[in-house]
Interface confidence: low
């Protein structure tokens, strides 16, 4: 259980006060991290307060700044980037964003050594994506699709690639669903470690279909926004992976790296890079049908200037009860040999852990193991090797930090961060410096964030970086919900839950309850996290008890969980959030006649299937950004866990499992759906359809539409957004204004 | 760039054999991936095997266990070995390079081309 501290004393009572969604809209509560932007074995940068970029030195104490906020300002710069070398820094601005993780901005470069800003061989704007080169001061850019390599800022570029076209050909970015779907990154291009080659990809976007959907804008027209975007079935990005020698690039140009023979038999992704050596380099190839990932390791040939992937250096993973990997399939973290790696994969009881690889996966030497699942590799040096997990007392919402000692035998575990704050920090990352010499950790909660320095040789806390001292100050006259975590025994299933209770919750008393769902594939919601958010504000204000569950399909409790939903979405997630309703109800304290159910992109996919159920459990709910039908969808997500929409494959589950199909049961429940317009990932089709199917039925429903917002509903949309939906839940729950 | 010149075609009754030769000219003829097409008559021109410049091969689900193609660098050569040859197999047989990788099937990914070896298997 995890009970937040009590400061509700009788004698304080009339001080406290509970929260209210003006607080939630402004952020009153937000809590700060420190991350360091590392530059070498003891030193990093932090942007301070007033917008300095100061560097500090671990070792000798000191600390100075290299860029004035004043330059900083001069241009406007919101982000900024140091040269290996030190000798120049480049300046973002008129940053615009496009979507989840790209953007287009301008850049300046900053000449440390003069104080002056380069002249000559500007860079063209907007850029879509500029990095230093990991040593010295060359320079990769990405504009208007194509790449350019400068030797130094002020030299003219070399253009390497000549094919980009908006929507058809990309070069070192990714595409729509490259971006959202495999990369995770607004860049597809990498420097090998000392910057002698450059690896990029390029995507073909010619054959996919385009969503095209309207941005009102205020124009007199619309304007017609396209994407391409292939949903389940449709023809997918063709991609090729290059390789060019940045020392002599005009010398033999960009070289292509092979695919796998076993893989480019049929459709294929590439699903990352990672450079070992110079002239040593790792690509992982994963099947469209996504059960099959392959590990390519390709060495540089010197006399034909190619690049070569023996077959002895393929390693195949295959998952037989689900998809390769979790949300992705992970990626190898090479040892000093520069051959042999460290993974984390699927052990034969089903549990993701890590495995050491010599030679061939077959042969792999299982590192951890456990009912618990390795989460993240950090760092691997010589000696140590630094990942999470979610070991520690059994709580799959938690991270702890461990280290492996590997250059001893037998190689002994230490939980770094189990003991240090118990209380106040369950769920933690961490950031290393080069060799592992200091770590900064984060802890996320369930206690006020805090961040820390530790020395990497001893673990020792050298000092605080963050401990929001002034948001725990701002907390002390507030009345904060009770939260804990705990599990129910279901069926041979264990199903994890979170309880957000009111401050002077009464077992005794009845409450409305609130279920709060994501539920899609291989994701956490009970986390042990601190958070003042929107169910917050519910519990302490309006005395509802909010719960989130985790259900089949989702993450960290082995694969037999995780792959339940394998080719059945929609059935087992919402089945398991009715099981934990009616389990909370035997719990003597909820309202029967209260209940409701809320969610956003998967979330809204799968309240309103729980709310078309057909139990009777809700009253009412809510769904925002809904997902109506797995055929709307992207290719990759989808098909990762769905297979394709064809007669010989799944195409009877995609219908199946639409909302639309349970339009009738919609009847005796309040609905409320909510999209935006320019929603450029779960498109506004989705809601649409919903819409439609439901008016053809005579159902009657509220609606609210977000003109030109995307996914996110950001901005003054959040707060119209929220202060919607509290008065929704108000009155469905009959709570006065 | 690359030229190619194919040789070695001809009537071959079925379950016959033949070995069709490319010859190629051009310094770096061994950082090239080869390939053999062929096209049938009223047919689109279908990849039937390819080889990287690193020796991996390809082949057609059609061809797999009776063809065999391979090179030879100091010769600036490609073979396709064609074994078990059936009707079905008659085609004109075009040779074909490019850079990078060998595991494209369509054609517009090949950027050099010969002019063609005619192969007829008569039953």
């Known amino acids: 259980i995890v009970l937040r501290p009590s400061r509700v004393h009788n004698s304080e009572e009339n001080t406290m006060r509970a929260l209210t969604l003006k607080d939630i809209l402004n952020g009153t509560f937000s809590y700060k991290t420190f991350f360091p932007n590392w530059i070498s074995g003891q030193e990093y940068l932090h942007q301070s307060a007033d917008n300095n970029i100061v560097l500090y030195n671990i070792e000798t104490g000191q600390s100075y700044t290299i860029l004035s906020n004043r330059t900083m300002k001069s241009v406007n710069a919101s982000n900024y980037g140091l040269s290996p070398d030190r000798q120049f820094v480049y300046l973002e601005s008129d940053y615009s964003k496009l979507w989840r993780y790209s953007y287009t901005a301008t850049y300046y470069i900053y000449d440390l050594s003069n104080g002056e800003f380069v002249r000559g061989n500007e860079l063209p704007r907007p850029i879509q994506y500029l990095c230093w080169s990991p040593v010295g001061s060359k320079l990769a850019y990405v504009y208007q699709n194509n790449i350019y390599l400068k030797q130094r800022p002020g030299d003219p570029p070399f253009q390497i690639t000549f094919n980009g076209r908006e929507n058809k050909i990309f070069n070192g970015i990714p595409d729509w669903v490259y971006e959202e779907e495999m990369l995770a990154t607004k860049y597809a291009l990498w420097w090998s470690p000392n910057g002698k080659f450059l690896a990029y990809a390029e995507f073909n976007d010619t054959d996919i279909p385009v969503i095209a959907y309207s941005y009102y804008g205020d124009e007199q027209y619309p304007r017609t926004i396209n994407i391409p975007y292939p949903k389940a079935g449709a023809k997918n990005p063709v991609v090729r992976i290059f390789i060019i020698d940045t020392t002599y690039p005009a010398y033999v140009g960009p070289q292509e790296v092979p695919v796998p023979a076993m893989i480019a038999s049929s459709d294929y992704y590439f699903s990352w890079l990672t450079w070992v050596t110079d002239e040593r380099v790792c690509l992982q190839w994963l099947k469209r049908v996504q059960n099959v990932s392959v590990l390519s390791i390709c060495d540089f040939r010197e006399d034909w200037q190619t690049w070569d992937c023996p077959k002895t250096q393929e390693h195949i993973e295959e998952s037989r009860t689900g998809w390769a990997g979790g949300f992705f399939v992970s990626t190898p973290v090479f040892s000093y040999d520069a051959i042999s790696y460290y993974k984390i994969f699927s052990d034969k009881d089903g549990y993701k852990h890590i495995h050491y690889i010599k030679d061939t996966v077959e042969n792999a030497i299982q590192i951890t193991s456990g009912k618990w699942e390795a989460i993240n590799i950090f760092r691997v040096t010589q000696d140590s090797l630094f990942y999470s997990s979610n070991e520690f007392e059994e709580y799959p919402g938690r991270r702890n930090i461990y280290r492996i000692s590997i250059g001893s035998y037998p190689p002994s575990k230490k939980c770094v961060t189990c003991h240090l704050r118990k209380e106040r920090c369950q769920y933690y990352t961490a950031s290393f410096s080069d060799y592992a010499k200091y770590y900064a950790l984060v802890c996320y909660g369930p206690g006020i964030p805090i961040s820390t320095l530790h020395d990497g040789r001893t673990d020792q806390e050298i000092k605080i970086l963050e401990e929001n001292k002034e948001l725990e100050n701002a907390l002390k006259n507030i009345q904060l919900p009770k939260e804990e975590i705990k599990k129910l025994e279901v069926d041979e299933i264990t199903l994890w839950y979170k309880m957000i209770l009111p401050p002077q919750f009464d077992r005794s008393k009845k409450y409305p309850l609130l279920i709060q769902v994501y539920g899609g594939p291989c994701s956490q919601s009970v986390r042990s996290v601190f958070a003042v958010n929107w169910i917050s504000y519910l519990a302490s204000k309006e005395g509802m008890v909010i719960a989130l569950v985790d259900g089949r399909g989702t993450a960290f409790q082995g694969d037999k969980l995780l792959y339940a939903v394998y080719r059945k979405l929609g059935v087992y997630e919402v089945e398991d959030q009715i099981t934990a309703v009616r389990k909370f109800i035997e719990m003597g304290f909820i309202d029967e006649k209260r209940i409701a159910i809320w969610g956003w992109s998967y979330g809204g996919y799968v309240s309103s299937l729980a709310l078309a159920s057909g139990t009777g459990l809700f009253k009412c709910g809510i769904a925002v950004a809904p997902v109506s039908s797995w055929e709307y969808y992207a290719s990759v997500y989808t098909e990762r866990f769905m297979g394709l929409p064809t007669k010989d494959d799944n195409l009877e589950h995609y219908k199946n499992s639409t909302v639309m199909a349970r339009a009738e049961y919609f009847r005796n429940v309040d609905y409320l759906l909510i999209h935006g317009t320019a929603d450029d990932n779960v498109h506004f089709q989705n809601s649409a359809q919903i819409a439609k199917a439901l008016v053809n039925a005579q159902v009657d429903f509220q609606a609210m539409w977000y003109s030109d917002q995307n996914h996110g509903l950001s901005g003054l949309s959040t707060n119209h957004l929220y202060t919607h939906m509290t008065h929704f839940l108000k009155q469905c729950f009959s709570l006065s204004d | 760039q690359v030229q190619l010149q194919e040789s070695g075609g001809g009537l071959v009754e079925a379950e016959g054999s033949l070995r069709l030769s490319c010859a190629a000219s051009?310094?770096?003829?061994?950082?090239?991936?080869l390939a053999w097409f062929r096209q049938a008559p009223g047919k689109s021109r279908e990849l039937v095997a390819a080889?990287?410049?690193?020796?991996?091969?390809y082949y057609a689900d059609s061809v797999k266990g009776r063809f065999t193609i391979s090179r030879d660098n100091a010769r600036n050569t490609v073979y396709l070995q064609t074994n078990s040859l059936k009707p079905e197999d008659t085609a004109v047989y075009y040779c074909?390079?490019?850079?990078?990788?060998?595991?494209?099937?369509?054609?517009?990914?090949?950027?050099?081309w010969g002019q063609g070896t005619q192969v007829t298997v008569s039953s």
């Open positions: 080889i990287s410049s690193g020796g991996s091969t």
């Open positions: 051009g310094r770096t003829f061994g950082t090239y991936a």
């Open positions: 074909a390079a490019k850079t990078g990788s060998a595991y494209y099937t369509n054609r517009i990914d090949w950027p050099y």
